[in-house]
């Protein structure tokens, strides 16, 4: 039960995270005009990964796409690449994790296959989250560097009578969305990896444990039983006791070492 919950929660958290990464990547407000200690302008500038926008006081907003590829800073290209890789890995991870969910049964898929798929999706989510966090952090670092450079320019080279309004940019909403989304995807991935340990069938052959039912001595050896598909009766997967029948799923409902993660 705890394994299913951990897996399900990991999937949901990752889903929210990846949706956030996609939203952050598409948002225009990666950097916004710094209004502190600056002349109050009647226009507000903000920039995204794909276009820059200007909003006039009247509400009129004009956005222009970056229609050049070679003319863009290498750092911006790197951030774009990191965010896209994050989205692609996350999307594949989501696809894989849907089939890996314990609550969804597909054919006669073994627990070991579901465990492997859960681990795969978990790793993909972790890498996806790391890509997003790295992308946002690189952009934030670029902003900080440019901010202090433009601040230095504001106080130097003003020997002439004519002043130029230096537009400084600070962190936009997309950065915070990206950081949170990347973190959620990372957490979701870790949860999927933890759930994988609980899904993996027990390989160790424990010593026979004696169960006494109705005075009869029945030896029960835990082993690699195939998971019940749920389609029809599968007597191979049932251990018949004098006291009644219990499916493997019911046997697993007893506390195991994986339930305390």
């Amino acid at each position: 039960m705890a394994v299913t919950a951990c897996q399900g929660l990991g999937f949901v958290v990752s889903l929210i995270g990846i949706a956030g990464i996609i939203a952050a990547t598409c948002m225009d407000q990666w950097s916004t005009q710094d209004l502190y200690n600056n002349p109050v302008t009647a226009v507000f500038n903000y920039q995204g990964l794909w276009r820059s926008c200007v909003r006039e006081s009247s509400g009129f907003t004009e956005c222009r796409g970056y229609f050049t590829l070679l003319g863009l800073p290498a750092m911006l290209q790197a951030v774009r690449a990191l965010m896209i890789v994050g989205i692609v890995l996350g999307a594949i991870g989501l696809l894989v994790s849907i089939f890996a969910l314990k609550c969804i049964r597909i054919g006669s898929m073994e627990d070991s296959a579901k465990a492997n798929m859960t681990l795969t999706s978990g790793i993909m989510f972790i890498v996806s989250g790391l890509c997003a966090i790295a992308g946002v952090s690189v952009f934030a670092n670029m902003l900080v560097t440019n901010f202090w450079m433009s601040t230095a320019n504001m106080y130097t080279g003003m020997g002439g009578m004519v002043q130029t309004v230096q537009t400084r940019y600070t962190f936009g909403a997309a950065l915070f969305v990206g950081w949170v989304a990347g973190g959620l995807t990372l957490i979701g991935g870790v949860m999927m990896c933890i759930a994988c340990r609980g899904l993996a069938p027990e390989e160790t052959n424990y010593k026979a444990v004696s169960y006494h039912a109705s005075g009869h001595s029945v030896a029960y050896k835990p082993g690699g039983f195939k998971a019940s598909t749920g389609f029809g009766s599968n007597t191979k997967n049932k251990k018949i006791y004098d006291g009644g029948a219990r499916t493997e799923d019911e046997v697993q409902s007893y506390p195991s070492k994986h339930d305390y993660v």
């Epitope: 005009q33 002349p39 109050v40 302008t41 009647a42 226009v43 500038n45 920039q47 820059s52 926008c53 200007v54 006039e56 006081s57 009247s58 509400g59 009129f60 004009e62 222009r64 004519v162 002043q163 130029t164 309004v165 537009t167």
Partner: antibody
Framework: QVQLKQSGPGLVQPSQSLSITCTVS????????VHWVRQSPGKGLEWLGV???????DYNAAFISRLNIRKDNSKSQVFFKMNSLKPNDTAIYYC????????????WGQGTTLTVSS | DIVMTQSPSSLPVTAGEKVTMSCKSS????????????LTWYQQKPGQPPKLLIY???TRDSGVPDRFTGSGSGTDFTLTISSVQAEDLAVYYC?????????FGAGTKLELK
């Protein structure tokens, strides 16, 4: 067509306040802002302040302490009030619509001539 | 505050001639975000409120004759009337629409020679 009609007193005594109403037609105050500008022989055209479509205001720092602009969207009216008038506040006061482009003023009221004198 | 300096203060003209007037700002009115200059030109005739002619330094407002042309960037701007008509005799003002408080020039008066 777009129109801005102003109504207000012509003569005000020093230290009194000036109230002007700008009634607009042909557009909605929920879509456009309204600026206030004055013109005097001594100082030329001076921007005083603006009330935007959302109701937020921007004032000229030189007048912020004695200026208040508000509006009633349902009545299509903008209210301008300036306190503590002095003789050098004698001017023609205009309301003007904020153009959608370029932060400019595309339609102007006919003006309210104010004389501050005892 | 940004200071807008217009020259000349008075410009005597004859009908049909080409005239240019200048407007200089104490700070750049060029917005780096969209590469637009936030400078506006107005025309004011006696007893009337100002009328919008040109915004973004060079974009004519609707209904403005094409003999009016705005140019310039940063701090130096020019309004050109290619062939002055009698109805163009008025005072022309430039305005900073970029940094608050929005400020106007003292005007250039176009009058007959």
């Amino acid at each position: 067509q777009v129109q801005l009609k102003q109504s207000g007193p012509g003569l005000v005594q020093p230290s009194q306040s000036l109230s002007i109403t700008c009634t607009v037609s042909g557009f909605s105050l929920t879509r456009y802002g309204v600026h206030w500008v004055r013109q005097s022989p001594g100082k030329g055209l001076e921007w005083l302040g603006v009330i935007w479509s959302g109701g937020n205001t921007d004032y000229n720092a030189a007048f912020i302490s004695r200026l208040n602009i508000r509006k009633d969207n349902s009545k299509s009216q903008v209210f301008f009030k300036m306190n503590s008038l002095k003789p050098n506040d004698t001017a023609i006061y205009y309301c003007a619509r904020a153009a959608y482009f370029g932060n400019s003023f595309d339609y102007w009221g006919q003006g309210t001539t104010l004389t501050v004198s005892s | 505050d940004i200071v807008m300096t217009q020259s000349p203060s008075s410009l005597p003209v004859t009908a049909g001639e080409k005239v240019t007037m200048s407007c200089k700002s104490s700070q750049s009115l060029l917005n780096s975000g969209n590469q637009k200059n936030y400078l506006t030109w107005y025309q004011q005739k006696p007893g009337q409120p100002p009328k919008l002619l040109i915004y973004w330094a060079s974009t004519r407002d609707s209904g403005v004759p094409d003999r009016f042309t705005g140019s310039g960037s940063g701090t130096d701007f020019t309004l050109t009337i290619s062939s002055v008509q009698a109805e163009d005799l008025a005072v022309y003002y430039c305005q900073n629409n970029y940094i608050y408080p929005l400020t106007f020039g003292a005007g250039t008066k176009l009058e007959l020679k």
